[in-house]
């Protein structure tokens, strides 16, 4: 028979042939043959593998560090990562979880809505048309966007709300 | 290295004034907004008050406002923290922290005691 060119689901193609891939939780120890199953064995103590594989070697659980505020939330297992969290009242840097933070920034073209108490996180607010924020801040609002005509100049470039508008002065008629 | 030194608390009387500093170094000061926390005995961590990189916008929480006054010096890489009218509850231990505010990156801090 023709040597197959693809394979079914959960299976991989070696040497001209269709072997089972190894389910989450174990590791490859050796290829199918014409004669014998795909080997695999389960992954150790602290190791995971959460699909359907060809690895020869299991992945490390996460660390959550506890030097940098971190405490597990969920148990790793043969098949799971360990999920990080932080301690109480500190708050994920990313999805992640690699890092803590008191609280997080608003970036530019953010303000702050509410600072954060020991029990939520900074709540930020995009900059509404005529306010800027162009820093990244815990504390400071959007702030208005300079009126120009005030200082009887006139707008040379317009604000964003990263930035705030550039002023200058009024074009004279000559006579 | 981010390196964040405290000093300046002490035992007070009610009433009294304290001015708590923070030196700073590892990093460029003068480009990052500074903040003061505290921490009473078995509470948690309280934000005091914060303020922007050039030293023109500042923040308080209402338990301190017109009595605490945050500063900075970005020549000598310091920030201060000027304390009136100290009241018992102000009784913690106060620390600075520059933004983002992360776990491993903050000092040792200051005790400050106000007692009669």
């Known amino acids: 028979p023709e040597p197959p060119t693809a394979c079914r689901e959960k299976q991989y193609l070696i040497n001209s042939q269709c072997c089972s891939l190894c389910q989450p939780g174990q590791k490859l120890v050796s290829d199918c043959t014409e004669f014998t199953e795909t080997e695999c064995l389960p992954c150790g103590e602290s190791e995971f593998l959460d699909t359907w594989n060809r690895e020869t070697h299991c992945h490390q659980h996460k660390y959550c560090d506890p030097n940098l505020g971190l405490r597990v939330q969920q148990k790793g297992t043969s098949e799971t990562d360990t999920i990080c969290t932080c301690e109480e009242g500190w708050h994920c840097t990313s999805e992640a979880c690699e890092s803590c933070v008191l609280h997080r920034s608003c970036s530019p073209g953010f303000g702050v809505k509410q600072i954060a108490t020991g029990v939520s996180d900074t709540i930020c607010e995009p900059c509404p048309v005529g306010f800027f924020s162009n820093v990244s801040s815990a504390f400071e609002k959007c702030h208005p966007w300079t009126s120009c005509e005030t200082k009887d100049l006139v707008v040379q470039q317009a604000g964003t709300n990263k930035t705030d508008v550039v002023c200058g002065p009024q074009d004279r008629l000559r006579a | 290295e981010v390196q964040l030194l405290e000093s300046g608390g002490g035992l007070v009387q009610p009433g009294g004034s304290l001015r708590l500093s923070c030196a700073a170094s590892?990093?460029?000061?003068?480009?990052?907004e500074m903040w003061w926390v505290r921490q009473a005995p078995g509470k948690g961590l309280e934000r005091v008050s914060?303020?922007?990189?050039?030293?023109?916008?500042?923040y308080y929480a209402d338990s301190v406002k017109g009595r605490f006054t945050i500063s900075r010096d970005n020549s000598k890489n310091t920030l201060y923290l000027q304390m009136n009218s100290l009241r018992a509850e102000d009784t913690a231990v106060y620390y600075c922290?520059?933004?983002?505010?992360?776990?491993?990156?903050w000092g040792q801090g200051t005790l400050v005691t106000v007692s009669s």
């Open positions: 590892g990093f460029t000061f003068r480009d990052y």
């Open positions: 914060a303020i922007n990189p050039q030293g023109t916008r500042t």
């Open positions: 922290g520059k933004e983002p505010f992360r776990y491993d990156y």
